[in-house]
């Protein structure tokens, strides 16, 4: 969902301290959790009702390196006869994700946070009815 | 998706460049796009025929302190009539997203790259048939 | 019924400080972002800051970045907006704006007038 | 940003009469537009979210059409209490811009 914006006091020392030197943090290396995984049904892409196809992009200068964008293969969802059914709607699913940057100029290598749009899948949705008023 | 493992390359410096001192790296301050958020179709998590809640999360010593998790409502699907039908499955489409972890000491501040497991929604797909041998 | 009563406006000098307030009901005011817009004497609508529901999260226009702080106490059901360092060009009626999505503005209060004149 | 252009500025009819307001989108926007609709002395009224459903409470003779870059409001026929201005706005991309308005004055 969300991510905040930065502007505020997340990264900022307290108050009391004296500033961080030239606009830049320490981050300390290696990825608390990194061995964690997505574990999902097999193909659900395909066997979803509001079927997706997967795009990757690559970065060499961001991690991850890999970004993987769904794109909704239907305006409307699969039916149980496998005909699309224009009575209901895919819709992507986004996600508010950080990936890092990485900028070097010879030796000297810095990194920043970015956030991205990732769409994850795709979901079939009932159209907004409308009564008569 | 998948976050690679970051044991390898992408956050040291050349090898012909001085090792990085006290095993951290330089993050400068602010997010680059910060300003973009996620815009989805309104109630999408109510009008899904594999609805789902929302629970959010909230940690100060995070970014994005605030992470909101989804869980499917239903093991079936909701079909046209409104009921549960089983003989279709609700499953979670996870992400995997970076989050910041802060860690301070009095006036030392530092912070460590996190990885997150997010449920960002449900699809509803058709359960995977097992044949008879 | 979802009402939201904007206060704090008023007439002030270049470089001045103005604090506006939105006192919000009818609705679990802490689950929805916040917003609020502007419009000029005689002008269209513009955009200024959002608030999370929890206030985790922050946005502003690039015309209001740096002088302006959006803040919440949910436990008073208000939202405000600091005005700090006010321009001429910050003159506007200032209406605060329920959330039902992203910048999906469904219920909006009658508005606050802020005059920024020497 | 995304510049919203909507057309025509000012829009000249009798009650009963039908009218169509239009609003071009700089990129698209997807169907993540808005329809408002402001009185004198007034605050906005949202009547259409997400270019073509109806708010709660919104007439039926208020429809919305349009997606990506091209969406219009259409009035089927108006009522003495629809002369207003009209405005469109975006969400899809930070930061959510409005039109300029479209005025709908009595001929």
């Known amino acids: 969902r969300k991510i905040p914006k930065v502007g505020h006091t997340f990264f900022q020392k307290p108050e009391s301290c004296p500033p961080v030197p030239g606009g830049s943090m320490k981050l300390d290396i290696g990825i608390i959790n990194e061995n964690q995984r997505v574990s999902m049904s097999r193909n659900i892409e395909s066997r979803s009702t509001s079927p997706w196809n997967y795009t990757v992009t690559w970065d060499p200068n961001r991690y991850p390196s890999e970004v993987v964008q769904a794109q909704c293969r239907n305006l409307g969802c699969i039916n149980a006869q496998g005909k699309e059914d224009i009575s209901m709607n895919s819709v992507p699913i986004q996600q508010e994700t950080l990936v890092v940057r990485r900028k070097h100029q010879g030796c000297s290598v810095s990194f920043q946070l970015e956030k991205v749009l990732v769409t994850v899948g795709c979901t079939c949705v009932t159209p907004v009815i409308h009564h008569v008023q | 998706r998948k976050i690679p493992k970051v044991g390898h390359t992408f956050f040291q410096k050349p090898e012909s460049c001085p090792p990085v001192p006290g095993g951290s790296m330089k993050l400068d301050i602010g997010i680059i796009n910060e300003n973009q958020r996620v815009s989805m179709s309104r109630n999408i998590e109510s009008r899904s025929t594999s609805p789902w809640n929302y629970t959010v999360t909230w940690d100060p010593n995070r970014y994005p302190s605030e992470v909101v998790q989804a869980q499917c409502r239903n093991l079936g699907c909701i079909n046209a009539q409104g009921k549960e039908d089983i003989s279709m499955n609700s499953v979670p489409i996870q992400q995997e997203t970076l989050v910041v972890r802060r860690k301070h000491q009095g006036c030392s501040v530092s912070f460590q790259l996190e990885k997150v497991l997010v449920t960002v929604g449900c699809t509803c797909v058709t359960p995977v048939i097992h044949h008879v041998q | 019924e979802v009402q939201l009563l904007e206060s704090g406006g008023g007439l002030v000098q270049p470089g001045g400080s103005l604090r506006l307030s939105c006192a919000a009901s009818g609705f679990t005011f802490s689950s929805y972002a916040m917003n609020w817009v502007r419009q000029a004497p005689g002008k269209g609508l513009e955009w200024v800051s959002t608030i999370s529901g929890r206030g985790g999260s922050i946005y502003y226009a690039d015309s209001v970045k740096g002088r302006f702080t959006i803040s919440r106490d949910n436990s008073k059901n208000t939202l405000y907006l600091q005005m700090n360092s006010l321009r001429a060009e910050d003159t506007a009626v200032y209406y605060c704006a329920k959330e039902e999505a992203t910048w999906d503005f469904d219920y909006w209060g009658q508005g606050t007038t802020v005059t920024v004149s020497s | 940003e995304i510049v919203l252009t909507q057309s025509p500025a000012t829009l000249s009819l009798s009650p009963g009469e039908r009218a169509t307001l239009s609003c071009r989108a700089s990129q698209s926007v997807s169907s993540f537009l808005a329809w408002f609709q402001q009185k004198p002395g007034q605050a906005p009224r949202l009547l259409i979210y997400?270019?073509?459903n109806r708010a709660t409470g919104i007439p039926a003779r208020f429809s919305g059409s349009g997606s990506g870059t091209d969406f219009t409001l259409t009035i089927s026929s108006l009522e003495p209490e629809d002369f207003a201005v009209y405005y469109c706005?975006?969400?899809?991309?930070?930061?959510?811009?409005f039109g300029q308005g479209t005025k709908v004055e009595i001929k």
């Open positions: 997400d270019a073509s």
């Open positions: 706005q975006q969400r899809s991309n930070w930061p959510p811009t």
